[in-house]
Interface confidence: medium
């Protein structure tokens, strides 16, 4: 669809005569008839297949024709067509004399014709005017013409229809060749698809308008590229929704069980070495001069009873000093001036001569020690009880009184509440600080997995539209991860329009 435009510029009829040679009275009141038709090698009479148009009287004899397009007038003349422009045409322009006001053909005398021109040729669609001039023996006509496409039609033949729009059917303008050019933020064949926020995750995010990024269930963040971990996950992360993968040093279903008490709490004091010995339990190995569960107590150097043979120990700033009893000498009173003849062995100890009687050695009965059997054995001095156990001397032996949660000769064993397999139906047992917890398999619940419940929440395929189903372990419910274009707890809602029509 387009328009053939003809702009009449100047008509010269100096003598004011008709085609017959007869003069007009008082002058030639001139109007034009135009016929546009298909290409003919020889332009001949017949239907004006592309259209006709007539002008009012434009002037007398010789005159210039005013461009009247800006004022809504009839120059240039418009010959619209509703077909593909063929690229060729025939054009007939007749100049007529109007003796009166009635310009209809039947109202004019047959010899009122002033001049007639006929041209034919090729003409491409375009904005440029072609200027032409036709001269006969008595007249001259100067004019120009062109073919342009109607609004919303494009292409070499005005055959491509394209209407710019910005609504639900598309968001685009038209290029000169009629192809669509999407408005910013839109894409697709008809520019109906919004371009989401740059970087918005292809699977986990979607949008209903440009520069938007809406997250599907289980995902979060500006670009929907961060998974949401299991509800209650404390010290863990996820790589897919509802996971809880524990950070180093943490365990349990919710990663809330401390497996690295030493690092997280640094309980050992005074430079002691800390060793993890189970969940929330540890052992401190003290540096010399310190004692206590956390090596928090400073030992006197005399506490280790360094003076032998009944010597008494005195603390000093730079160490200690032994005061030896008669008959002994040395740093620790370890050297004797006595022999077995002096009965040096106490508490029933047996004396044995050494070095030809120059020295002796005492063999002590049970529960006594020291070079003269002068010390009662204290089996707790080596602090043998682990995990804060209390050491008790019991006659010839010792025993450890353990803190709650520990057992064994030296309190070295963590009491496992799981040892008796309390979780029914294949449940997994987790030791907690004060008790235990069962993780039940699908279909069971209760504190000990003793209650048979429904089968796996996803087994009934509750999610619509090919959504992925996840079972939420903490609530025994399902979560649907929707594909592009769907929302809702079961992905049952297409991302469409509300019932009002905002577009």
């Amino acid at each position: 669809s387009g328009v053939f435009q003809l702009q009449l510029q100047e008509f010269i009829n100096e003598r004011g005569v008709l085609a017959s040679g007869r003069p007009c009275e008082p002058g030639c009141r001139t109007f034009f008839r135009v016929c546009l038709k298909h290409f003919q090698a020889v332009v001949s009479p017949g239907p004006c297949t592309f259209g006709t148009v007539s002008t009012p009287v434009l002037g007398t004899n010789s005159f210039a024709v005013r461009d009247d397009s800006s004022g809504g007038g009839r120059n240039p003349l418009q010959l619209p067509f509703n077909f593909t422009w063929p690229g060729t045409f025939s054009l007939i322009i007749e100049a007529w004399h109007a003796p009166g006001d009635d310009l209809r053909p039947e109202a004019l005398p047959p010899d009122a014709l002033i001049s007639k021109i006929a041209i034919q040729g090729s003409l491409a669609v375009g904005q440029n005017w072609l200027l032409d001039e036709q001269t006969s023996t008595l007249t001259r006509l100067r004019y120009s013409y062109r073919v342009i496409c109607s609004d919303n039609y494009y292409g070499d033949n005005c055959s491509r229809l394209c209407k710019k729009r910005n609504d639900h059917f598309g968001h685009y303008v038209c290029q000169p060749d009629g192809n669509l050019s999407c408005l910013p933020g839109w894409t697709g064949e008809y520019c109906q698809q919004p371009i989401c926020l740059s970087g918005c995750h292809e699977q986990n995010g979607y949008c209903s308008k440009p520069a938007e990024c809406l997250c599907r269930p289980g995902w979060q963040g500006r670009l929907c590229n961060e998974c949401i971990p299991h509800n209650g996950c404390r010290h863990g992360t996820c790589s897919t929704p509802w996971q809880c993968t524990c950070d180093e040093g943490w365990g349990g279903l919710f990663c809330d069980q401390d497996l690295n008490y030493c690092t997280h709490h640094s309980p050992c004091k005074n430079g002691a070495t800390c060793s993890n010995s189970g969940q929330r339990s540890y052992t401190c190995t003290c540096r010399p001069g310190y004692t206590g569960v956390d090596c928090e107590l400073e030992l006197s150097e005399c506490d280790s009873n360094p003076c032998r043979n009944g010597g008494s120990c005195k603390d000093q700033e730079d160490g200690y000093h032994c005061l030896c009893p008669p008959g002994y000498y040395g740093l620790h009173c370890e050297h004797s001036t006595l022999s077995c003849a002096d009965s040096p062995c106490f508490n029933g100890g047996s004396c044995r001569e050494r070095n030809q009687g120059a020295n002796y050695a005492c063999e002590c009965p049970p529960n006594f020690t020291g070079s003269n059997c002068e010390k009662k054995v204290d089996r707790c001095t080596s602090n043998p009880c682990a995990n804060g156990g209390q050491c008790l001397n019991r006659g010839p032996s010792r025993m450890c009184r353990c803190r709650p949660g520990f057992t064994g000769t030296y309190c070295e064993l963590h009491v496992s509440d799981c040892a008796r397999n309390p979780c029914a139906h294949g449940g997994t047992c987790h030791d907690l600080e004060n008790g235990l917890m069962c993780t039940c398999p699908a279909g069971f619940s209760g504190r000990r997995c003793e209650v048979r419940t429904s089968i796996d929440a996803c087994a009934s395929s509750p999610c619509f539209n090919r959504a992925t189903c996840y079972t939420d372990l903490s609530t025994d419910t399902f979560v649907c991860n929707c594909p592009y274009g769907f929302v809702g707890s079961r992905c049952e809602f297409p991302v469409g329009l509300p019932p009002s029509f905002p577009w």
């Epitope: 209407k163 729009r165 609504d167 059917f169 598309g170 029509f501 577009w503």
Partner: nanobody, 123 residues
Framework: EVQLVESGGGLVQAGGSLRLSCAAS????????MGWYRQAPGKQRELVAA???????YYADCVKGRFTISRDYAKNTVYLQMNSLKPEDTAVYYC?????????????????WGQGTQVTVSS
């Protein structure tokens, strides 16, 4: 006032096809966009497909590639060809004239809804 009469619904097995028709009487709607809507029990009415006066089409993502909207200007009728039907397509289907920024706004007498036609897809 324009009367919109929907027909062509019924019971069909999943994977089957139906063709809905919407005939308008009392006015011509050649200048207006026309759309097919559906409403499942307990859900909001949603636009499924639309066709503008220059035959541009719009489809909701959930029906793209399965449903085709068309119109017959001579008969004042809009059609919805539904292929590869799924149980989730079960709903009452209505036709009406949505407003578009490009098409002239539908006259006020398009405001009333027809009775609709029930489409049930069994699995």
């Amino acid at each position: 006032e324009v009367q919109l009469v929907e027909s062509g619904g019924g019971l069909v097995q999943a994977g089957g096809s139906l063709r809905l028709s919407c005939a308008a009487s009392g006015s011509t709607f050649t200048s207006y966009a026309m759309g097919w809507y559906r409403q499942a029990p307990g859900k909001q009415r949603e636009l499924v497909a639309a066709i503008s006066s220059d035959d541009s089409t719009y489809y909701a993502d959930c029906v793209k590639g399965r449903f085709t909207i068309s119109r017959d200007y001579a008969k004042n009728t809009v059609y919805l060809q539904m292929n590869s039907l799924k149980p989730e397509d079960t709903a009452v289907y209505y036709c009406n004239a949505p407003h578009s920024d490009y098409d002239e706004e539908a006259p006020s007498d398009f405001g009333s809804w027809g009775q609709g036609t029930q489409v049930t897809v069994s699995s």
